[in-house]
């Protein structure tokens, strides 16, 4: 569910304090059965 360009080094932002993971994983989606 995302489009990503570039890298995700996240060299400056303190992601812990921002509440966001440094490089969030793609949410897994289950195929409709």
């Amino acid at each position: 569910s995302e489009t990503t360009t570039g890298t995700s080094s996240n060299s400056s932002q303190s992601t812990s304090n921002s509440g966001l993971a440094p490089n969030p994983t793609n949410a897994t989606t289950k195929a409709a059965g």
Epitope: S1, T4, S8, N10, S12, Q13, T15
Partner: antibody, heavy 115, light 112 residues
Framework: EVRLEESGGGFVQPGGSMKLSCVAS????????MNWVRQSLERGLAWVAQ??????????RYVESVKGRFTISRDDSKSTVYLQMNNLRPEDTGIYYC??????WGQGTTLTVSS | DVVMTQTPLTLSLTIGQPASISCKSS???????????LNWLLQRPGQSPKRLIY???NMDSGVPDRFTGSGSGTDFTLKISRVEAEDLGIYYC?????????FGGGTKLEIK
């Protein structure tokens, strides 16, 4: 004190375009990921887009429903993040908040897409 | 997408009563760095959301210590030891582990 101030909302017809802006103060802007979040009565709070840092080559992420229609960008020299919205749909209606993550939020700007 | 399910939908309490809000995620929010990116927000009437808690249990500055966050994996709880008038509004959980980041539907706290 951190302040995020959005502007640019208004009324637009389906298929139209709008550009939102958010000016930040009280923080080292180039060091923060910036995000747009939409709030609507029908869908509640929903993340829309994210732009990362210069050191990340300004990586961007978009929620599926706005891919190809919305573009997030930033101007670190102006401490400003933008959201260019094209081919707008009624379901894009809502209050758009600029956020640094989950920690700091602007007051929001309202977009109404209707014929 | 990760579905965040909050219960109850509404809490109607008198001043001084305790409150408990549950948030369950459809996938584990434990990230590879060992941290769990689960946040709690409060949106007071007519205002934008304000964060209360991040990383499950870390309180933001200025947040009264009557608020506590707990949980792990997929089950999380926000507790208010004694509700005060200023606590009214809608509480949201939001996860920052998986993209797209997703929010719970909200729990409205009303003061009787």
């Amino acid at each position: 004190e951190v302040r995020l101030e959005e502007s640019g909302g208004g009324f637009v017809q389906p298929g139209g375009s709008m550009k939102l802006s958010c000016v930040a103060s009280g923080l080292t802007f180039p060091n923060h990921w910036m995000n747009w979040v939409r709030q609507s009565l029908e869908r509640g709070l929903a993340w829309v887009a994210q732009i990362q840092l210069k050191s990340d080559n300004y990586a961007t992420r978009y929620v599926e429903s706005v891919k190809g229609r919305f573009t997030i960008s930033r101007d670190d020299s102006k401490s400003t993040v933008y959201l260019q919205m094209n081919n707008l749909r009624p379901e894009d209606t809502g209050i758009y908040y600029c956020t640094t993550g989950t920690d700091y939020w602007g007051q929001g700007t309202t977009l109404t897409v209707s014929s | 997408d990760v579905v965040m399910t909050q219960t109850p939908l509404t809490l109607s309490l008198t001043i001084g009563q305790p409150a408990s809000i549950s948030c369950k995620s459809s996938q584990s929010l434990l990230y590879s760095d060992g941290k769990t990116y689960l946040n709690w927000l409060l949106q007071r009437p007519g205002q934008s959301p304000k964060r209360l808690i991040y990383l499950v249990s870390n309180m933001d500055s200025g947040v009264p210590d009557r608020f506590t966050g707990s949980g792990s994996g997929t089950d999380f709880t926000l507790k208010i030891s004694r509700v005060e008038a200023e606590d009214l509004g809608i509480y949201y959980c939001v996860q920052g582990t998986h993209f797209p980041y997703t929010f719970g539907g909200g729990t409205k706290l009303e003061i009787k």
